[in-house]
């Protein structure tokens, strides 16, 4: 903590400007009024303060707002956000998407830090649900964001938000997460016609039950092997050879290359050899 010392004559800051970079830490502490800093936070990012100087500025804000910063200050924190701890952020009440975007921009290009994770958690909890605009914003900055949520957290995603989800946002989701997301996607896309529906639902099919896969097999969807490999084992096992052939269409030949991998291996094992032979792929049950 910076020692309390009187501000030297003529050094009292009238505004936040470039001259402050020449101030020693104790001078910043003594000569910069916290209330002035709070009202001119937007200027801080344009000034090349050292990390040590930023520590002083943070300390001044902490003293002014012991219960947590107001959103008017948070929105303009800029690089000072990187100095915040998760404990600091837990005191905040962030409601504006613009504030969230401004802070995510500071961390752009880096992995999600504990600070960012706490910020997002506070924001989403404040909103009560993960709405479409928020999801759009978060997945733009962190494509893996959705798959970092627990199944319980995903249950707060309204079906309307599913429209914001891109296939790459689901790349790292596990079966438990897709089990939650699939019914929401099914609901969100229910009014689309066959081929359009399949394009949209395809990324979510890792959560689909057997009945839905059987229904898709009747619609000439030509599912690719990459999608088939992501299906739930328990959903695939009851499918007949004829149903899998219809589901995959021309991609059925790809089963041979995946015969040693799950869930293809599990499915092959449970089929009658006579039925497998009809595929002409040399699959051994």
């Amino acid at each position: 903590e910076v020692e309390k010392t009187a501000c030297p004559s003529g050094k009292k800051a009238r505004e936040i400007d470039e001259s402050l970079i020449f101030y020693k830490k104790w001078e910043l502490e003594a000569c910069v009024d916290a209330a002035l800093l709070a009202t001119q936070m937007d200027r801080v990012n344009a000034i090349p303060f050292t990390y040590e100087q930023l520590d002083v500025l943070k300390h001044k804000l902490d003293e002014l707002y012991p219960q947590g910063y107001p959103e008017s200050v948070i929105q303009h924190l800029g690089y000072l956000f990187l100095k915040m701890s998760p404990e600091d952020i837990r005191k905040w009440n962030v409601t504006s998407l613009e504030t969230l975007k401004a802070l995510l921009e500071v961390n752009k290009g880096h992995e999600m830090s504990p600070q960012v994770a706490t910020l997002i958690d506070r924001f989403v909890k404040g909103r009560g649900q993960l709405d479409k605009d928020t999801l759009d914003t978060l997945t733009a900055f962190y494509p893996g964001y959705l798959c970092s949520l627990s199944p319980e957290e995903l249950s707060s995603v309204p079906p309307s938000s599913i429209w914001a989800v891109r296939p790459q946002d689901l790349d790292t989701c596990d079966p438990r997460q897709l089990d939650v997301l699939y019914p929401k996607a099914r609901l969100a896309f229910q009014n689309m016609n066959g081929s359009e529906y399949f394009v949209k639902i395809q990324s979510f099919l890792g959560g689909a039950p057997t009945e839905d896969l059987k229904a898709l097999s009747q619609q000439n969807v030509s599912m690719d092997l990459a999608t088939f490999m992501k299906l739930r084992t328990d959903a695939v096992l009851p499918l007949t050879v004829a149903e899998v052939q219809k589901l995959l269409g021309p991609h059925v030949e790809g089963l041979k290359a995946e015969e040693r991998h799950r869930p293809v291996r599990d499915w092959i094992l449970r089929q009658r050899q006579d039925d497998l032979d009809t595929l002409g792929l040399g699959l051994q049950g």
């Epitope: 079966p175 438990r176 040693r260 991998h261 799950r262 291996r265 094992l269 049950g285």
Partner: antibody, heavy 119, light 107 residues
Framework: QVQLQESGPGLVKPSETLSLTCTVS??????????WSWIRQPPGKGLEWIGY???????NYNPSLKSRVTISVDTSKNQFSLKLSSVTAADTAVYYC???????????WGQGTMVTVSS | DIQMTQSPSSLSASVGDRVTITCRAS??????VNWYQQKPGKAPKLLIY???SLQSGVPSRFSGSGSGTDFTLTISSLQPEDFATYYC?????????FGGGTKVEIK
């Protein structure tokens, strides 16, 4: 509740064939979702999967043991068996039989049987 | 075959500690990785399946995460009964393989 019990000789001579049987109780070896595996653990070492069988008779073996391993199933007795030929001292281990549920993993294990290869 | 490399091979920890064990697959195992606990003289016990699903009857202090090649088993607050050896295992490829094991000992 499904239980597994290994049985067989505890001592086998080098170059002979090791034979073990696993008896399934409280459930059926003919279950649709399950495969039945043999796994071994040499003293003080880690686990090594040997192979599995499905009730239809389809098998899948560890490539490093494939030439010496035969796993068979007897649905009428609710048993499956392991034969490992041309054994050496390196085959000395605790041998476990285990059920693998396709949706989970090796969720049920026998208590294991120690087999020593020595003359 | 897919090789499973576990680390550390052993660790010392105290009751109440948070313990993390990692397992790296030599090629993608998708999410088909399971975790087992084994105590001396006993058969292994399934803790986590499909990378992150908790096996029925297993305490919630155990959790798993990961996909592709990197997997983690976490014990949030180590209990006296948790001192044991832990193994990861992949079942994505038909040739199942186990990690070398991690022995968790009392500090």
């Amino acid at each position: 509740q499904v239980q597994l019990q290994e049985s067989g000789p505890g001592l086998v001579k080098p170059s002979e064939t090791l034979s073990l049987t696993c008896t399934v109780s409280g459930g059926s070896v003919s279950s649709f979702t399950d495969t039945w595996s043999w796994i071994r653990q040499p003293p003080g070492k880690g686990l090594e999967w040997i192979g599995y069988i499905y009730y239809s008779g389809s098998t899948n073996y560890n490539p490093s043991l494939k030439s010496r391993v035969t796993i068979s199933v007897d649905t009428s007795k609710n048993q499956f068996s392991l034969k490992l030929s041309s054994v050496t001292a390196a085959d000395t281990a605790v041998y476990y039989c285990a059920r693998e549920d396709a949706l989970t993993g090796f969720d049920i294990w026998g208590q294991g049987t120690m087999v020593t290869v020595s003359s | 075959d897919i090789q499973m490399t576990q680390s550390p091979s052993s660790l010392s920890a105290s009751v109440g500690d948070r313990v993390t064990i990692t397992c790296r697959a030599s090629q993608s195992s998708r999410y088909y990785v399971n975790w087992y606990q084994q105590k001396p003289g006993k058969a292994p016990k399934l803790l986590i399946y499909a990378a992150s699903s908790l096996q029925s009857g297993v305490p919630s202090r155990f959790s798993g995460s990961g996909s592709g090649t990197d997997f983690t088993l976490t014990i949030s607050s180590l209990q006296p009964e948790d001192f044991a050896t832990y193994y990861c295992q992949q079942s994505y490829d038909a040739s199942y393989t186990f990690g070398g094991g991690t022995k968790v000992e009392i500090k």
